[in-house]
Every structure is written in structure tokens, then in C-alpha cells.
């Protein structure tokens, strides 16, 4: 069941030291391996990422039309796919947290949904028949995220906004803002 | 050009010591972390030692820890490896490498220096 | 023992893809980025691939890297005779003291 969008425009999450998650603690001694900690590099620093957009996670609004079968919504829905990549070395030298930026590998963070927003839509259906009404769950915000074992590796693929879309039937993850944590997904909808 | 140097590797006795060096040249070289990586006969690569830009960001492998130390100097461009109570299984081709972004992978390399560890 | 997983050998004629797999674990791979490196026949490693799937400039976009779950992998596309190497992912491992881990290596030939 295709699906028809077109890219309206895209925001970039420019991430600041308090949007990343404290690493999990590290067990590998007690030393202060962070300069961020003493006061900061001095200006001149290496880890500033001379290509600003080498690493960038980015909100790209999609506008479409939820289909079921062949069923369509009335309107167009607008929603947000996560793309673009995240990294540390993205990040000014106050702002690695205690991450041990100077390491050749470290925590990996990736660009992935956020919040979410649950929308009533009305599906007009072919042959007169009634119009059916239908909750869907939409992204509403993406950021910079460490990877752990518990994000669902659906929303973690690499390359480009294919990955951040939700896949049919898989279990929505319970969320601590309130919202339902069986709310539905976007069933059908692709 | 981006070079590093190595230089101290030789034929030592098993439990003696022995003092490696990498000299760099052809960047701003406190703007590098720079590691050890080694590479036994006819292996692969081990990760041994790596130091930010001062004495405070050190690291090592299990496998060198108590007995090797790491540590550099900025005002020479100079990386070392102090090597004590060296054993037969420290017998490889020692690399000096650099990364100058963060969490970037080691992305300059020198050619190596052989240690061999013998009686 | 290496505590990320190579095969040990790859091969494929020129014009093939090829695709080298990396296997580790949540205190790897799993929750840290990923690099690879291309070793020359007796020369010093190169830097390949870095935070899962970037290139440094001067590598050609023939080769690539992703990233799923406590696996990475390279691929290689449009092999070329001088792709013959040894080649090598590392991550950060996060367990007892921290160390950065290399795999053991896939030697890879152009047949």
C-alpha cells in the first residue's frame, strides 16, 4: 500500500549538552578523563567539526495521506521522519558531557524519534461506505539519543529516513510522558 | 605532511624494560590523542595504550596495565611507551597512531617499531 | 581470542561486492561506534570507516559501513585488484576496565 509525501522542509536538532543522556557510568577507573570538566580546551580545539554538517540530526516533514486498504484519509497528515547522523565530535568541547571524546570509538547516539502525538483521522472509503475513523501515532520530535540494548533496532537502522519510519505491527515502546503505551501505530498506513 | 615516527624498539630479555618513542611532525600535534597499537608475527591488531591531550586522559589494555606507561610530550611532539617487566608475548610491531576527532577511529599512522622479547 | 568476530578469509573478483561482517556485543559494538581499517600487505593500518558508516576524506565511496544491533559490517562494492588487504573493525568496549577491541581480521583476496 504506497503512500504519497513530499518533503516540506527539515529542522536541525543542533544538540546541546543538556539533550544528551548521562552515559551509563563508566567502570574503568576514577580520573577525571574530561577537560570539559576542568574549564574547557582552550579556543583552539580539535574536535571542532570543521564540516558543520557532517553530523546533523535532522526533522524532515512529510505530508501524506494515511491509507487502509483502500481506504484513504480525508486530508493529509503531517508528520516527522528522524534522519541525519549524530556524534560527538559534532559537539564543542564544553559539550561532551563525560563522554571520553578522545577515544577513537565511543558512545554512539543516533537520530531517532522523540516524542510522539497521537492524530484522529477519517478514512474515506471507495463504494459509498461509511468513513471510519482511525487513531494513528505520529512523530513529533527526534533527537540525539545514546544507543542502548532496549531502543528497538527498527528505528536504529543506518542510512537515511527509510529506517525512522515505524514498522507495521511492531509493539510501541511505553513511554513516561503519560501517553498510552499501547497507543496504535500507524497500522496499514505504508 | 602527516607523519609519525617510531623509534626504541630492539631485542630485549624477557623481564627487562625498554622505552619506545614517536615523534611527529607535520600537524598540530597536541591537537591529536595518540595511541600504541601493536601487532604480533603474522596477527592481528591490539589496541594497547592511548593519551589525550594531557596526563589525565590515559587508558590501557588489560593486557599492559601496571607494566606499561604511556605518556607524551608536547613540547618535543613526542609520544613514549615506557615497557617494564617485558614478556615473550609483548614480541610484536609497536604502531604509534593519532585521532584528532572525537571518537573518530585512529586516522594517522606511523610504519612501526619491532620489539622482540627473547632470552 | 578476539572479542570482536571476523571471518577469517573473503573473497571475490574484481567488479564484485563483498561484504565483511563484524560481530561483538552490547559492550561493543552495541552501544559504541564502530571503525574499520584497511591493512596493505606489509604496510601500516589505514582508517577506513569511522562512527559506523563515515568515510575520512580520500576514501573512495566503494567502501562502506553499517551498523545493526551488536553487528557492523563493510562492504565493498566494484572490488579492485588493490582492495587485497587485511581488514579489521574496532569499537570501543565499555566492560571491566574499557579498552578499545579490535576484530580479528578478514583477509580478503581478489580473485
Known amino acids: 500500500q504506497g503512500w504519497q509525501a513530499f518533503k516540506n522542509d527539515a529542522t536541525e536538532i543542533i544538540p546541546e549538552l543538556g539533550e544528551y543522556p548521562e552515559p551509563p557510568p563508566e567502570l574503568e577507573n576514577n580520573k577525571t578523563m574530561n577537560r570539559a570538566e576542568n574549564g574547557g580546551r582552550p579556543p583552539h580545539h580539535p574536535f571542532e567539526t570543521k564540516d558543520v554538517s557532517e553530523y546533523s540530526c535532522r526533522e524532515l516533514h512529510f505530508t501524506r495521506y494515511v491509507t487502509d486498504g483502500q481506504c484513504r484519509s480525508a486530508k493529509p497528515v503531517t508528520e516527522l521522519v528522524c534522519s541525519g547522523q549524530c556524534g560527538p565530535a559534532r559537539l564543542l568541547p564544553n559539550a561532551i558531557g563525560r563522554g571520553k571524546w578522545w577515544r577513537p570509538s565511543g558512545p554512539d547516539f543516533r537520530c531517532i524519534p522523540d516524542r510522539y502525538r497521537a492524530q484522529r483521522v477519517q478514512l474515506l472509503c471507495p463504494g459509498g461506505a461509511a468513513p471510519r475513523a482511525r487513531k494513528v501515532r505520529l512523530v513529533a520530535s527526534c533527537k540525539c539519543k545514546r544507543l542502548t540494548r532496549f531502543h528497538n533496532q527498527s528505528e536504529l537502522k543506518d542510512f537515511g529516513p527509510e529506517a525512522a519510519r515505524p514498522q507495521k505491527g511492531r509493539k510501541p515502546r511505553p513511554r513516561a510522558r503519560g501517553a498510552k503505551a499501547n497507543q496504535a501505530e500507524l497500522e496499514n498506513a505504508y | 605532511e602527516v607523519q609519525l615516527v617510531e623509534s626504541g624498539g630492539g631485542l630485549v630479555q624477557p623481564g627487562r624494560s625498554l622505552r619506545l618513542s614517536c615523534a611527529a611532525s607535520?600537524?598540530?600535534?597536541?591537537?591529536?590523542?595518540l595511541h600504541w597499537v601493536r601487532q604480533a608475527p603474522g596477527k592481528g591488531l591490539e589496541w594497547v595504550s592511548g593519551?589525550?591531550?594531557?596526563?589525565?586522559?590515559?587508558d590501557y589494555a588489560d593486557s599492559v596495565k601496571g607494566r606499561f606507561t604511556i605518556s607524551r610530550d608536547n613540547a618535543k611532539n613526542s609520544l613514549y611507551l615506557q615497557m617494564n617487566s617485558l614478556r615473550v608475548e609483548d614480541t610484536a610491531l609497536y604502531y604509534c597512531?593519532?585521532?584528532?576527532?572525537?571518537?573518530?577511529?585512529?586516522?594517522?599512522w606511523g610504519q612501526g617499531t619491532t620489539v622482540t622479547v627473547s632470552s | 581470542q578476539s572479542v570482536l568476530t571476523q571471518p577469517p578469509s573473503a573473497s571475490g573478483t574484481p567488479g564484485q561486492r563483498v561484504t565483511i561482517s563484524c560481530s561483538g556485543s552490547?559492550?561493543?559494538?552495541?552501544?559504541?561506534?564502530v571503525n574499520w581499517y584497511q591493512q596493505l600487505p606489509g604496510t601500516a593500518p589505514k582508517l577506513l570507516i569511522y562512527?559506523?558508516?563515515q568515510r575520512p576524506s580520500g576514501v573512495p565511496d566503494r567502501f562502506s559501513g553499517s551498523k545493526s544491533g551488536t553487528s557492523a559490517s563493510l562492504a565493498i562494492s566494484g572490488l579492485q585488484s588493490e582492495d587485497e588487504a587485511d581488514y579489521y573493525c574496532?569499537?570501543?568496549?565499555?566492560?571491566?576496565?574499557?579498552?578499545?577491541?579490535f576484530g580479528g581480521g578478514t583477509k580478503l583476496t581478489v580473485l
Open positions: 597512531a593519532g585521532n584528532n576527532r572525537g571518537y573518530g577511529g585512529l586516522d594517522v
Open positions: 607535520g600537524f598540530t600535534f597536541d591537537d591529536y590523542a
Open positions: 593519551i589525550g591531550w594531557d596526563e589525565d586522559m590515559i
Open positions: 552490547w559492550s561493543n559494538i552495541g552501544s559504541n561506534t
Open positions: 562512527n559506523n558508516n
Open positions: 574496532a569499537a570501543w568496549d565499555d566492560s571491566l576496565s574499557g579498552e578499545y577491541v
